[in-house]
């Protein structure tokens, strides 16, 4: 546990102006209000630690209420360069430029940042999500079109005195929110440049950032209700493990997913759930207020610690991995989707994980901190937990080394 080390000024304490600056919900992402251009144009921007471009809708789109109008900004500069970002499903493309950017409920600074003005997209914007752009907070290595395009956070740190660190508290509601409730609800906090003690309980535990591209970490052990999955730990990180606020689910490599589901099924076998539930296709419902949380196991991920042969564990509850869904057809019940799914690109610790914890992205010290979130949903019997230290040997062997090819095959 390394929370007691001295910190440089400005790194810790209270950041009142930034608390509660996020809105949204896990299924459609968490967004922060930003202003772009002169005079300032206000947009809601998805906070995404799984990508590295600042990209905003810059043309009319049926799912956008508003968009960035470059022609109205006196400070816009065209970089005369296009950018095309394909996803496994969908894509966005646009034109690169720079403009003045600030975060009203963030540090009191304005920075000139690279902006991708999205002119065309497919399966990118989400109907009803209320965000118009994306703030990629990961590293330059995965920026598009290449790593020479400086990400927003790098620009912010270079141009200001803001410390090279941010922290996220994503607050799942624990119940489904309709559109008006989302607009009015608090979704959490993005603390830029520091750590706010009011947002977590207990101690912060840190895991090294393995490589500065995504926020890559190493998982060394997985337990379901305290039972070790007993897999070669390389499988947990095949081909990587990342912390990604832009993903809803906890996504696991195929073999790990199958083993985890088998174990969760066994632990919750007092009820018979349809196959489609484990696939995320069918909802399961209980009479309002009767969800049997106790029949579902807790899930613990052990992460490499900062000290040799030392690890710590983060434990989530079913309140995190069963996502509440509103369906008019079954509105008299409490219905849920299973929010753990299969991945072909490694483990993704998405909102399902992050909603249990206050997560510190300490870029300056190349580490990610976890503490129990002050806003996580729990019951009177169990709570999310961050605990350690545990002795774990040969943790370096748990990392998977992605074969390097001449051509980048990165597909976000």
């Amino acid at each position: 546990e390394t929370d007691e080390e001295p910190e440089e000024p400005g790194r810790r304490g209270s950041f009142v102006e930034m608390v509660d600056n996020l809105r949204g919900k896990s299924g459609q992402g968490y967004y922060v209000e930003m202003t772009v251009g002169s005079p300032p144009q206000t947009l809601n921007i998805l906070v995404d630690t799984g990508s590295s471009n600042f990209a905003v809708g810059a043309a009319p789109h049926p799912f956008l209420h508003r968009y960035y109008q470059r022609q109205l900004s006196s400070t816009y500069r065209d970089l005369r360069k296009g950018v095309y970002v394909p996803y496994t499903q969908g894509k966005w493309e646009g034109e690169l430029g720079t403009d003045l950017v600030s975060i009203p409920h963030g540090p009191n600074v304005t920075v000139r940042a690279n902006i991708a003005a999205i002119t065309e997209s497919d399966k990118f914007f989400i109907n009803g999500s209320n965000w118009e752009g994306i703030l990629g907070l990961a590293y330059a290595e995965i920026a598009r079109p290449d790593d020479s395009l400086e990400p927003f956070f790098d620009s912010l740190v270079k141009q200001t005195h803001v410390p090279n660190l941010f922290s996220l508290q994503l607050c799942g509601a624990g119940f489904p929110l309709n559109q008006s409730e989302v607009l009015a609800s608090v979704g959490g906090s993005m603390i830029i440049g520091g750590i706010d003690h009011s947002l977590y309980t207990g101690s912060l535990w840190y895991t090294p950032i393995r490589r500065e591209w995504y926020y890559e970490v190493i998982i060394v052990r997985v337990e379901i209700n305290g039972q070790d999955l007993k897999m070669d730990c390389k499988e947990y990180n095949y081909d990587k493990s990342i912390v990604d606020s832009g993903t809803t689910n906890l996504r696991l490599p195929k073999k790990v997913f199958e083993a985890a589901v088998k174990s969760i099924k066994a632990a919750s076998s007092t009820e018979k759930f349809p196959d489609g539930f484990w696939l995320g296709e069918q909802l399961v419902c209980w009479q309002a207020g009767t969800t049997p949380w106790n029949i579902f196991p807790v899930i613990s991920l052990y992460l490499m610690g900062e000290v040799t042969n030392q690890s710590f564990r983060i434990t989530i509850l079913p309140q995190q991995y069963l996502r509440p869904v509103e369906d008019v057809a079954t509105s008299q019940d409490d219905c849920y989707k299973f929010a753990i799914s299969q991945s072909s690109t490694g483990t993704v610790m998405g909102a399902v994980i992050m909603e249990g914890f206050y997560v510190v992205f300490d870029r300056a010290r190349k580490r990610i901190g976890f503490a129990v979130s002050a806003c996580h949903v729990h019951d009177e019997f169990r709570t999310a937990a961050v605990e350690g230290p545990f002795v774990t040997l040969d943790m370096e062997d748990c990392g998977y080394n992605i074969p390097q090819t001449d051509e980048s095959t990165l597909m976000t």
């Epitope: 499903q89 989400i126 018979k272 759930f273 349809p274 489609g276 069918q282 419902c285 057809a329 079954t330």
Partner: antibody, heavy 116, light 107 residues
């Protein structure tokens, strides 16, 4: 209000193919899977398969694996079912349905008639 | 595949009566059974899920019961608008399968 609007009736020749559509509205399209169901007179309901609009993942009834292909266009919130190499056995009413718990919402039906 | 058997193809009843439609699964499906009503020329309408839960807006004269392999849809105080075919469905495992249907006739 959740609605699934299906395309109109089709009269097609044997050996050809047809593409049926199902346009969804009233909910977040990518949050729920879409199923397709076949109904022949006096033969009840047969599940053809399903698609997840968020990533186009599909699962088929083995019986229809070589007959039906499901696709989505999220920009128009529309799911499609392509039926190939049509025979008289494919003459039927086809429904799309939205998942939730079982199939709470159904489209209004598309009649496909295969005739020379 | 799980076979859902509705042994009665037709049932005759009178307005105001109580009628029970049965359905048997070839293997244990827990309570992962739904019931649908289909009127002539219309799409199926969802009535019951999880064997016994009514979908929103479904009149409370429709009641579902059962678990494991034996399921029943009961309509109490039958109304003329209940003239329809009723299908059970298991959604416990792929492939999803339906019963052959029971046509309710009003005397």
């Amino acid at each position: 209000e959740v609605q699934l609007q299906q395309s109109g009736a089709e009269l097609v020749r044997p050996g050809t193919s047809v593409k049926l559509s199902c346009k969804a509205s009233g909910y977040t399209f990518t949050s729920y899977w879409i199923h397709w169901v076949k109904q022949r007179p006096g033969q009840g309901l047969e599940w053809i398969g399903m698609i997840d609009p968020s990533d186009s993942y599909t699962k088929y009834n083995q019986k229809f694996k070589d007959k039906a292909t499901l696709t989505v266009d999220t920009s128009s919130s529309t799911t499609y079912m392509h039926l190939s190499s049509l025979t008289s056995e494919d003459s039927a009413v086809y429904y799309c349905a939205r998942s939730g718990v079982a199939f709470p919402y159904w489209g209004q039906r598309t009649l496909v008639t295969v005739s020379a | 595949d799980i076979v859902m058997t509705q042994s009665q193809k037709f049932m005759s009843t009178s307005v105001g009566d109580r009628v029970s439609v049965t359905c048997k699964a070839s293997q244990n499906v827990g309570t992962n059974v739904a019931w649908y009503q289909q009127k002539p020329g219309q799409s199926p309408k969802a009535l019951i899920y999880s064997a016994s839960h009514r979908y929103s807006g479904v009149p409370d004269r429709f009641t579902g019961s059962g678990s494991g392999t034996d399921f029943t849809l009961t309509i109490s105080n039958v109304q003329s608008e209940d003239l329809a075919e009723y299908f059970c469905q298991q959604y416990n495992s792929y492939m999803y399968t339906f019963g052959g249907g029971t046509k309710l006739e009003i005397k």
